[in-house]
Amino acid sequence: VPRWRQQWSGPGTTKRFPETVLARCVKYTEIHPEMRHVDCQSVWDAFKGAFISKHPCNITEEDYQPLMKLGTQTVPCNKILLWSRIKDLAHQFTQVQRDMFTLEDTLLGYLADDLTWCGEFNTSKINYQSCPDWRKDCSNNPVSVFWKTVSRRFAEAACDVVHVMLNGSRSKIFDKNSTFGSVEVHNLQPEKVQTLEAWVIHGGREDSRDLCQDPTIKELESIISKRNIQFSCKNIYRPDKFLQCVKNPEDSSCTSEI
């Protein structure tokens, strides 16, 4: 008789999840000499320990503390790039501007990027069939709690000028319910962070509106100002040219507004 299994609304654990986490960990520690000391078997054991045998709607930040400890990493606190709903461009940017870092450029972010995982209460099995959906099932699921935990820590570490890349093509350019809006904004430390600079990325070719005047950006400015952090905003009208100019800042066409 097959064991009854909880059916969740979200996709199941990414296939070859353990192998993927281990392979990514080894690759990351090979590429980043400052993380060579990390033992990837221990990282996997800590990762697994955070959700295996636990009810996938009952995960806490505490469950991830052993993993956080093992993955402790110092990134230059004044070189942090946050993003919301525009991950690919943010990652393309840090691939070119190597001294800046998104969360996914850190070990823990790199390990989990684009992966899904969950377990089952009281069994050591990984659930490859389905995992809880944040909206339809529960918010305290293994994936959501992981990203909340690492995002909070990443924001807490930031200092000086923090940059955030926002998607100007969306109806809510700043969304209070995004990880950036619900976690990172509220965990920037006013005693360390002087300014939050938003880069609003335009999608349309002929879109010359000043999206820094968007009501949701004004809302972000209000939240940030109330936290005693200065706010500035820039329109990035041509993201393709923006990346090109990051690659070749001497290019004559890069002196004009991007």
Epitope: E30, H37, D39, C40, Q41, S42, D45, K48
Partner: antibody, heavy 118, light 109 residues
């Protein structure tokens, strides 16, 4: 300097017990998985057991499962191997190894000799 | 019980090239087995040479290289030196447990 020093080896009768220790220094012991490996006289290496950084995960070779127990005390930077129901075929040099996943065992102790004989 | 098989012995001339292989009884060796290679000389503990299939340690001479070859892990020594005479062991990872190969005695004649 990373160092591993094994102790506790000796001559023991079949069926008896012995506990090996491995004192670690020069690295953050509590962040690493650790292993025991043995080598019988004139024979090859045999992986015995591995323990995760916090002691929560342990894996054993089939030849020692149920008889040997690997453990660690992170406050003392020490790895242990409790060996029960010893047999003549357990006679070997036992090495403690600092294991980094994917990197193989990149630091080894000098080994401690266990002889099981009546 | 998983068995990892190596050539028991190989002989090579100084300056020559030799390839040692490592096969798994469970099927093809892949990068998921994270093959590692060790060198051991009489009276000494083993010394790691290659990890993660093909990456050499900082102390490993460049004449040593690792690869996957026809479903096996392989260690190639190019321009063999007299001091390379030793026993060589591969180690494979099986989801927590590890298994050493039986070892290859390399003679440099």
């Amino acid at each position: 300097e990373v160092q591993l020093v094994e102790s506790g080896g000796g001559l023991v009768q079949p069926g008896r017990s012995l506990r090996l220790s491995c004192a670690a220094s020069g690295f953050t012991f509590s962040s690493y998985a650790m292993s025991w490996v043995r080598q019988a006289p004139g024979k090859g290496l045999e992986w015995v057991a591995v323990i995760s950084y916090d002691g929560s995960n342990k894996y054993y070779a089939d030849s020692v499962k149920g008889r040997f127990t690997i453990s660690r005390d992170n406050s003392k930077n020490t790895l242990y191997l409790q060996m029960n129901s010893l047999r003549a075929e357990d006679t070997a040099v036992y090495y403690c190894a600092h294991l980094r996943f994917g990197y193989g065992m990149d630091v080894w102790g000098q080994g401690t000799t266990v002889t099981v004989s009546s | 019980q998983t068995v990892v098989t190596q050539e028991p012995s190989l002989t090579v001339s100084p300056g020559g090239t030799v390839t040692l292989t490592c096969a798994s009884s469970t099927g093809a060796v892949t990068s998921d087995h994270y093959p590692c290679w060790f060198q051991q000389k009489p009276g000494h503990p083993p010394r790691a040479l290659v990890y993660s299939t093909d990456t050499i340690h900082s102390w490993t001479p460049a004449r040593f290289s690792g690869s996957l070859l026809g479903g096996k892990a392989a260690l190639t020594v190019s321009g063999v030196q007299p001091e390379d005479e030793a026993d060589y062991y591969c180690l494979l990872y099986y989801g927590g447990a590890r298994v050493f190969g039986g070892g290859t005695q390399l003679t440099v004649l």
